[in-house]
């Protein structure tokens, strides 16, 4: 089995709207073009600040709630999935 | 490990430009944005902007829209800051930081004095 | 251009838990503000805590931690420690550019 473990346990404020987003896009003349803005990609922060946290699992980034997650091995549990379970 | 190496101190003429760098090491600056604050003598911190170094990409500040230049080399990791027109008003530290969704990772700063 | 307001300071004990908030001129901070909260420290020494209203920086200790408190972005330190004293800043995104509030210069006695 796999456990996903919260790195913090997210917002209950979800009125988060799509067009914004820490990344910067470069400014487009003739105004801003809300599509391209929202469809750029953004980068990963498991490929960046947070590569070596998770210990014993996967990070997982949640684009949409801007919220790192560690997906735990079998049998570790915990924030970075460094806690061993006694089975 | 981690860090951020600012360009040393500049005095530099009212009315001139300076570019101030900031070197990457322990982590590739194109995984990163890279952002520019400035701070003045006993007040808080000013966002100028940041940039994607990957593509290029930049955002800058209202205030600094047209006066800063943000560039980036992936080859030597190091990111560029470039102000123009400088007056007393940017008498200040200027810092560099790093990160994705977090201001992870934060440069010394660089002193930046304007002389008349 | 928005404004993002903190408190100018509190003084908090040793062990004790302390909120810090980071409100914005243009209505209730929300999770699409992307709340980033930085700690100075004297001689100019910048530390990242949070980032996207929840996430702590990786090695940053677990007593602090990053919500939204009713309209408002907030930093908590659950059990504050001496070494805590520090100026923190918030900062906001909006749409395309971010705003940093004054600062928080927080003590512990």
């Known amino acids: 089995s796999v456990r996903v473990e919260q790195v913090v346990k997210p917002p209950q404020n979800k009125t988060e709207s799509e067009n914004t987003s820490d990344k910067p896009k470069r400014k487009k003349k003739g105004g801003k073009n809300g599509k391209n803005r929202r469809n750029r990609k953004k980068k990963n922060p498991c490929n960046a600040e947070f590569q070596n946290f998770c210990i014993h699992g996967e990070c997982k980034y949640i684009e949409h709630l801007e919220a790192v997650t560690c997906k735990c091995q079998q049998e570790y549990f915990g924030e970075r999935c460094g806690e061993k379970s006694m089975k | 490990e981690v860090q951020l190496q600012q360009s040393g101190a500049e005095l530099v003429r009212s009315g001139a430009s300076v570019k101030l760098s900031c070197t990457a090491s322990?982590?590739?600056?194109?995984?990163?944005?890279i952002h520019w604050v400035k701070q003045r003598p006993e007040q808080g911190l000013e966002w100028i902007g940041c940039?994607?170094?990957?593509?290029?990409?930049?955002e800058y500040a209202p205030n600094f829209q047209g006066r800063a230049t943000m560039t980036a080399d992936t080859s030597s990791n190091t990111a560029y800051l470039q102000l123009s027109s400088l007056t007393s008003e940017d008498t200040a530290v200027y810092y560099c930081?790093?990160?994705?969704?977090?201001?992870?990772?934060w440069g010394q700063g660089t002193l930046v004095t304007v002389s008349a | 251009q928005a404004v993002v307001t903190q408190e100018s300071a509190l003084t908090t004990s040793p062990g004790e838990t302390v909120t810090l908030t980071c409100r914005s001129s243009t209505g209730a901070v929300t999770t699409s503000n992307s709340a980033n909260w930085v700690q100075e420290k004297p001689d100019h020494l910048f530390t990242g805590l949070i980032g996207?209203?929840?996430n702590r920086v990786p090695g940053v200790p677990a007593r602090f931690s990053g919500s939204l408190i009713g309209d408002k972005a907030a930093l908590t330190i659950t059990g504050a420690q001496t070494e805590d004293e520090a100026i923190y800043f918030c900062?906001?995104?909006?749409?395309?550019?971010?705003?940093f509030g004054g600062g928080t210069k927080l003590t512990v006695l």
């Open positions: 940039i994607d170094p990957e593509n290029g990409d930049t």
């Open positions: 930081y790093g990160g994705t969704i977090t201001f992870a990772y």
């Open positions: 322990g982590f590739n600056i194109k995984d990163y944005y």
């Open positions: 900062a906001l995104w909006y749409s395309n550019h971010w705003v």
């Open positions: 996207g209203t929840i």
